[in-house]
């Protein structure tokens, strides 16, 4: 009987010899549950598992807790991989998180965190980040220490308001904080002075809604 080869992340896919960008099926160890993820096999040495992408506003990111838990969208386009998968993956070994950003003027920037993991669902998928470098700001636009994840039906933020309803999208809101990469997608020339756009404050400042974002992870020892 032929043994089924499975990969937990895109780094394993890359090391197995598949070095082409594209959608691959991933499976966690000791699990039968599969997820489809986009693998970036070119950027910075390859092996990156894309956990979020915004590029054209084609997918609605104002989703429920369950949808953010299991993932939604199209891995070839705009999507969210899923908090549960990312939580389990990042608690099995050490991962880095790279956030790549594009503005409407043709500029690109990134933030790289040398250690990233999400807590379990019981702890509201709280984000943990350490060691920021990159060109998208010297201060982390994801509030530190990390916050719990909030969605339109799960208010875990530190605001008297409900950040996910006010800003739209699920995110690790503070009150509400300097970022929200899952906010409303605004087209060019309609992307400034926005209270609920795709925000990364320490790169583009207040009210600027970005053209594109990609969140990707890779084992630290890759």
């Amino acid at each position: 009987k032929e043994e089924q080869i499975s990969f937990r992340d895109c780094a394993e896919v890359f090391k197995s010899g598949h070095t082409t960008n594209g959608v691959y099926t991933l499976t966690l160890p000791n699990s039968t549950e599969e997820v489809k993820a986009y693998c970036d096999m070119e950027a910075g040495g390859g092996g990156w598992t894309i956990i979020q992408r915004r590029e054209d506003g084609s997918v609605d990111f104002q989703r429920t807790w369950k949808e953010y838990k299991v993932g939604f969208g199209n891995p070839s386009g705009e999507y969210w991989l899923g908090n549960e998968f990312v939580s389990q993956l990042t608690n099995q070994q050490r991962y880095v998180l790279k956030i790549h950003l594009k503005d409407w003027e043709g500029n690109e920037a990134y933030s790289l965190y040398e250690h990233f993991y999400l807590s379990s669902e019981e702890l509201n998928y709280r984000i943990h980040l350490k060691g920021l470098t990159g060109t998208a700001g010297k201060i982390s636009s994801i509030s530190q220490p990390g916050n719990d994840f909030s969605t339109k039906d799960a208010d875990n933020d530190k605001c008297i308001c409900k950040c996910s309803q006010m800003l739209t999208g699920g995110w690790w809101f503070d009150a509400c904080g300097p970022s929200n990469l899952n906010g409303m997608y605004y087209p060019q020339r309609q992307n400034t002075n926005k209270f609920n756009g795709i925000k990364w404050y320490y790169w583009k400042g207040s009210g600027y809604s970005l053209k594109g974002t990609t969140m990707m992870i890779r084992p630290a020892d890759f």
Partner: nanobody
Framework: EVQLVESGGGLVQAGGSLRLSCAAS????????IGWFRQAPGKEREGVSA????????YYADSVKGRFTISSDNDKNTVYLQMNSLKPEDTAVYYC??????????????????????WGQGTLVTVSS
Amino acid sequence: EVQLVESGGGLVQAGGSLRLSCAASGFTLDDYAIGWFRQAPGKEREGVSAIRDSDGSTYYADSVKGRFTISSDNDKNTVYLQMNSLKPEDTAVYYCAAVPAGRLRFGEQWYPLYEYDAWGQGTLVTVSS
């Protein structure tokens, strides 16, 4: 479309007065807080004063307390900053900005700079000695 337009800046002698206006459109002052900020050449943008119509709260930086007064006119959807006893160190570009009033951290009264998502273009205030 949210828009903020400042006016009223100019050149004034030390000890003089100016009144800045911030005309808001695309939203009503009832639901938002409006802040005045300033930025001098080579310096960080700093908060000067703010007003929240929903509960009547006002805020002043220590450096302007007793000299500046913030007020609003809901009918005109405009916020004013009356600046008296001006000093050369008040020289800066003055901006007004808006934040949804409810975007407050538990236990806090005011908002960090990054919560103000709508900004005007600014008006220059020059105080000569």
